[in-house]
């Protein structure tokens, strides 16, 4: 017998979609061999309709796909826009069609529900609203109007025009009688439940001359949309529940065992601890739609998710809902990178951020996740030369090492830098990744003086002491600016005396600035790297002042000047409040973002989720001096 398994019979109706899962033993050969879905002909044979090697028959063009899940030993065939012509016998299988590794599936597509013997069919989604229209004749205009539900053999009164409401419908039903011109009354039922489904009878009048109309109410549980995303990648759930719930609390929950649906995030401020640092709920549109982004996908994130609206911010009977079944593909295209990076206070971290290597020209971004409200991620730096003002001199985004990875360096670490950061681009939205920075106890490895004052026209020498642990690393000095850190010539001055228990392999490397000018003012970094991979860095601010006395300055670790307490704005620069703009990359249609910078005032978009609070001034050039 064949080891392939699947549904023997699939029954659906015209216009629907089906998702057919075929199971196979997950041996390494099976995992990587061709998967196919074919239709059996009258004379034997099986005509391929779709395969894992990219073939799609013209019959299926634009309405079918086949996705392999090698780690589960399954593949799924999705077919949309079914018609009765799709009814027939099929095979799902592995290898070549004529070989025995297959499973027979019978697909039967029947005609959709229509009007049967004067019964009006209403097909409505769970949690939504239905309006049942009931016509009547003039002679019954003044008589009692009522709606009954057929329960078994007996009609049970649901509502009538004298004010009766069946307890099962309290607070969610009303009977409207149209103006005198129209001989029609309507019954509106909100927050539809599955138990509301069934046969209804509306009636005007109570005698033998009464007008009657049958209605068949079908309440559909939403079909889960199948979503396949890569491990470590990102998923966006777009939830459109309709304008009638625009002002009701929204939620996303994940079904656990049984009936429970555990809240992942809601608009009342609840967020599941497992999603801390890697989830954003974007602000609602006027039509009540919203979306939720989850990054850093884990194997255990797979499952069924429901979004909905209810005043409690969680799933309740009658909540309008949308459903997804999320599969997390463990054979991910997104490379492993550390999810936690530890840095010592006063020192630095170098974070490697993956991106889709096909999009090397995309703009790279780094943002800081904030848990306030529904989560937001204000941008800190990008690859086009923008750095948030508070991070000047200590944050740099480098395109190196390239080929699918960029680097973010943050130095002068303090406990306030602990938190979750997102790497993203304006290209493939699935490649958003999350890293947590933790600040730990310890001493920085690199030793540099505190901030330094240079004198115009003179020479300045700034030392950087490297311990022996970095003996095999390349050591460098560079001058920080918004676009990166430009390498500068430096001198190896031999072993350093700044370290106890450190042999000849320690190093003192100096930066020399000859004939200092105003342009030399700014931040300088010394650091270590191996090829294109960056390690620890240390930063020094060099201020430039008028000559007081002749001579050159050689700065030691002890005699550096203290840093000024505040930055002073250049008189020519107008600091304009930075508006927090909804970032189109994280939400909306997920389209590639246009550059949202306003060149005139230096304001800047933030990856925001609902707040329009000020975002500190932004910087494209050096606006500040000391």
């Amino acid at each position: 017998k064949s080891p392939i398994f699947g549904p023997e019979e699939v029954n659906s109706v015209e216009g629907n979609s089906v998702s057919i899962t075929c199971y196979y033993p997950p041996t390494s050969v099976n995992r990587h061999t061709r998967k196919y879905w074919c239709r059996q002909g009258a004379r034997g044979g099986c005509i391929t309709l779709i395969s894992s090697e990219g073939y799609v028959s013209s019959k299926y063009a634009g309405r079918a796909n086949l996705t392999n899940f090698p780690e589960n030993g399954t593949f799924v065939v999705n077919i949309a826009q079914l018609s009765q012509d799709d009814s027939g016998r099929y095979k799902c299988g592995l290898g070549i069609n004529s070989r025995g590794l297959s499973f027979d599936v019978s697909l039967e597509v029947s005609q959709g529900p229509g009007l049967l013997n004067d019964t009006k069919v209403y097909t409505v989604d769970l949690g939504r609203t239905v309006t049942i229209n009931c016509p009547f004749k003039t002679e019954n205009a003044q008589k009692r109007k009522s709606l009954y539900k057929q329960i078994g053999l007996y009609p049970v009164l649901v509502i009538d025009s004298s004010g009766y409401v069946n307890p099962n419908y309290t607070g969610r039903i009303r009977l409207d009688i149209q103006g005198t011109g129209q001989l029609l009354f309507s019954v509106v039922i909100n927050q539809l439940r599955l138990s509301d489904a069934g046969q209804y009878l509306c009636q005007a009048g109570d005698d033998s001359n009464s007008n009657k109309k049958n209605a068949d109410l079908q309440v559909l549980k939403p079909e889960p949309e199948l979503v396949y995303e890569d491990l470590r990648g990102s998923v966006t759930f777009h939830c459109a529940l309709g304008p009638e719930v625009a002002n009701v609390a929204k939620f996303l929950c994940r079904q656990s065992s049984g009936e429970n649906c555990d809240v992942v995030v809601n608009t009342l401020g609840k967020r599941a601890p497992a999603f801390e640092g890697r989830i954003l709920l974007n602000p609602q549109d006027k039509d009540g739609s919203f979306s939720v982004v989850i990054t850093g996908l884990r194997k255990e994130d797979a499952g069924r998710y429901l979004c909905g609206a209810h005043s409690d911010g969680q799933l309740q009977e009658g909540s309008p809902i949308q459903a997804w079944q999320l599969f997390v593909n463990e054979e991910s295209t997104i490379p492993r990178s550390p999810t936690v990076v530890k840095g010592v206070a006063g020192s630095s971290v170098a974070v490697l951020c993956p991106y889709n290597r096909k999009e090397s020209k995309s703009i790279k971004y780094w943002c800081l996740w904030e848990g306030a409200q529904n989560g937001r991620c204000p941008l800190l730096v990008d690859s086009e030369g923008w750095v948030k003002a508070q991070y000047e001199g200590r944050l740099s985004l480098l395109e190196e090492p390239g080929n699918g990875t960029f680097t973010v360096i943050l130095n002068q670490l303090t406990s306030r830098d602990a938190g979750f950061y997102w790497c993203l681009t304006n290209g493939d939205t699935l490649w958003r990744t999350t890293v947590e920075i933790k600040i730990i106890e310890g001493e920085p490895n690199l030793k540099v003086p505190g901030n330094v004052t240079a004198v115009l026209g003179e020479t300045l020498k700034v030392p950087c002491h490297f311990p022996c642990k970095f003996s095999s690393y390349e050591k460098y000095w560079c001058k920080w600016n918004n676009t990166g850190c430009q390498a500068l010539p430096s001198q190896d001055e031999g072993p350093s005396k700044a370290f106890v228990n450190c042999d000849e392999n320690s190093r003192l490397v100096s930066l020399t600035l000859n004939l200092v000018t105003r342009a030399d003012e700014g931040w300088y970094w010394c650091g270590v790297k191996q090829g294109h991979f960056y390690g620890e860095t240390a930063a020094v601010y060099v201020a430039v002042e008028e000559r007081k006395a002749a001579g050159s300055r050689d700065v030691s670790l002890a005699k550096a000047d203290a840093a000024p307490d505040e930055k002073v704005l250049d008189s020519g620069f107008r600091e304009i409040e930075n508006k927090a703009i909804q970032d189109p990359r994280l939400f909306a249609e997920e389209k590639a973002v246009a550059d949202t910078r306003d060149q005139a005032d230096g304001s800047r978009a933030s990856v925001d989720s609902g707040s329009s609070e000020e975002q500190g001034g932004s910087s494209r050039h050096h606006h500040h001096h000391h």
Epitope: F5, P7, E8, E9, V10, N11, S12, V13, N16, S17, V18, S19, I20, Y23, N72, T74, L126, R193, L194, L220, K221, P222, E223, P224, Q255, S257, G258, E259, C261, G303, R304, E317, Q325
Partner: nanobody, 126 residues
Framework: QVQLVESGGGLVQAGDSLRLSCAAS????????MGWFRQAPGKEREFVTT??????????YYADSVKGRFTISRDNAKNTVYLQMNSLKPDDTAVYYC?????????????????WGQGTQVTVSS
């Protein structure tokens, strides 16, 4: 919680038919699939058949040993699943359990099911 109650078991002759019912009550709104497993004395619980649904689409799965003889169906309005068993054999003797699931990755695996009935005995004599 979802409660499942099986009925219809009994003693029949080989070649006869039997129809089992499984009525679900309670919070059935997120139930995604219902099926039948069986357990003969001294043996492990084994998959028989399952029906899963999504909107107005039904998917029916059968074990090789019952293909062509057993049929699963459901009455959505009554929250009931039926198992029609034809051409019964002595090997079909077992306690038949109804099971329901909210999320089903593989219908053949008992641990994928969240709710179970108490079981109904089916005995097929030769």
């Amino acid at each position: 919680q979802v409660q499942l109650v099986e009925s219809g078991g009994g003693l029949v002759q080989a070649g006869d038919s039997l129809r089992l019912s499984c009525a679900a009550s309670g919070r059935t709104r997120t139930t995604y699939g219902m099926g039948w497993f069986r357990q003969a004395p001294g043996k492990e619980r084994e998959f028989v058949t399952t029906i899963t649904w999504s909107g107005s689409t039904n998917y029916k799965y059968y074990a090789d040993s019952v293909k062509g003889r057993f049929t699963i169906s459901r009455d959505n309005a009554k929250n009931t699943v039926y198992l029609q068993m034809n051409s019964l054999k002595p090997d079909d003797t077992a306690v038949y359990y109804c099971a329901a699931s909210t999320v089903l990755t593989d219908p053949r695996v008992p641990t994928e099911y969240d709710y179970w009935g108490q079981g109904t005995q089916v005995t097929v004599s030769s």
